[in-house]
């Protein structure tokens, strides 16, 4: 069967929402009321990859945009980017590894580990209005824990 995608929003463990910051960057900040409409809606696809009870491979596209979060080396450092794809070919069940994240549920929080770069996670800063990035440390200053709110299509 074709890949199935469900729409969702993400908030970090400090309740910061994710919004677009220019055409190819996400930032995290606290939103309230009407401003919540600014938050990015992801189209999360259940893709092929190593799977267990607590770990599910997913790809995170931006709803109705041909942009996907991907992990690449930049200056020898694993880096998170928004990558433009051909909408005729995406999403697909066998996504390239740079697009795949292991959605890991630990207690009441979710982590998104890069499949391409194990132990590197989608992260936000403690500070407001800072870019969402790929971080190589858990449990430090940076935030790697999220909650997910599925939304109707």
């Amino acid at each position: 069967a074709p890949v199935r995608s469900l729409n969702c929003t993400l908030r970090d463990s400090q309740q910061k929402s994710l919004v677009m910051s220019g055409p190819y960057e996400l930032k995290a900040l606290h939103l309230q009321g009407q401003d919540m409409e600014q938050q990015v809606v992801f189209s999360m696809s259940f893709v092929q990859g190593e799977e267990s009870n607590d770990k599910i491979p997913v790809a995170l596209g931006l709803k109705e945009k041909n942009l996907y979060l991907s992990c690449v080396l930049k200056d020898d450092k694993p880096t998170l980017q928004l990558e433009s794809v051909d909408p005729k070919n995406y999403p697909k069940k066998k996504m390239e590894k740079r697009f795949v994240f292991n959605k890991i549920e630990i207690n009441n929080k979710l982590e998104f580990e890069s499949a391409q770069f194990p132990n590197w996670y989608i992260s936000t800063s403690q500070a407001e209005n800072m870019p969402v990035f790929l971080g190589g440390t858990k449990g430090g200053q940076d935030i790697t824990d999220f909650t997910m709110q599925f939304v109707s299509s």
């Epitope: 069967a1 199935r4 469900l6 729409n7 549920e105 999220f146 909650t147 997910m148 599925f150 299509s153």
Partner: antibody, heavy 119, light 107 residues
Amino acid sequence: EVQLVESGGGLVQPGGSLRLSCAASGFDFSRYDMSWVRQAPGKRLEWVAYISSGGGSTYFPDTVKGRFTISRDNAKNTLYLQMNSLRAEDTAMYYCARQNKKLTWFDYWGQGTLVTVSS
Amino acid sequence: DIQMTQSPSSLSASVGDRVTITCRTSGNIHNYLTWYQQKPGKAPQLLIYNAKTLADGVPSRFSGSGSGTQFTLTISSLQPEDFANYYCQHFWSLPFTFGQGTKVEIK
């Protein structure tokens, strides 16, 4: 044997609140996603709330969004549905159901608890 | 939202009859469809998932077929315990919606 037992239903006035519980046994509750599904008299089944195994993901359809909240206590093997600002159209039998990990089908259901919203 | 339409809404049949229930969807859901059985005053029970896979413990007289927008639940030889309501549900996109149900009654 998988068992899901709902409680907390009853008669409540419009605008009132109610909290439903679902006690789970016979399986490792902390490893399963859970949902609430309701059935109004003479109507089709309607999925009203979802929570992932650890509580990190949730879903509510537009009909209940902002009024209902779902939670779970994995130490107590119990699922909850907090229903606020209740309306006559929320009158239904409420079932808790165990769900497959990737948000798909409901493989076990409880017997249900009846919620009646009326003045 | 994807709309689910079951037909017929009700049917009368005899023990031993072959019974077919159809579920049509307003959009392509591929094979992301389940069937449930519900007896009066009881909880629904999973019969079939992924359009054609029988759930554990379900008798082989039940079968499912179809993909895309049209699906069928077939009971090859109706047994007394099969008189119940049957519901289809998709899980392709949110919200996952149910059909209105088909009541299978004794003729």
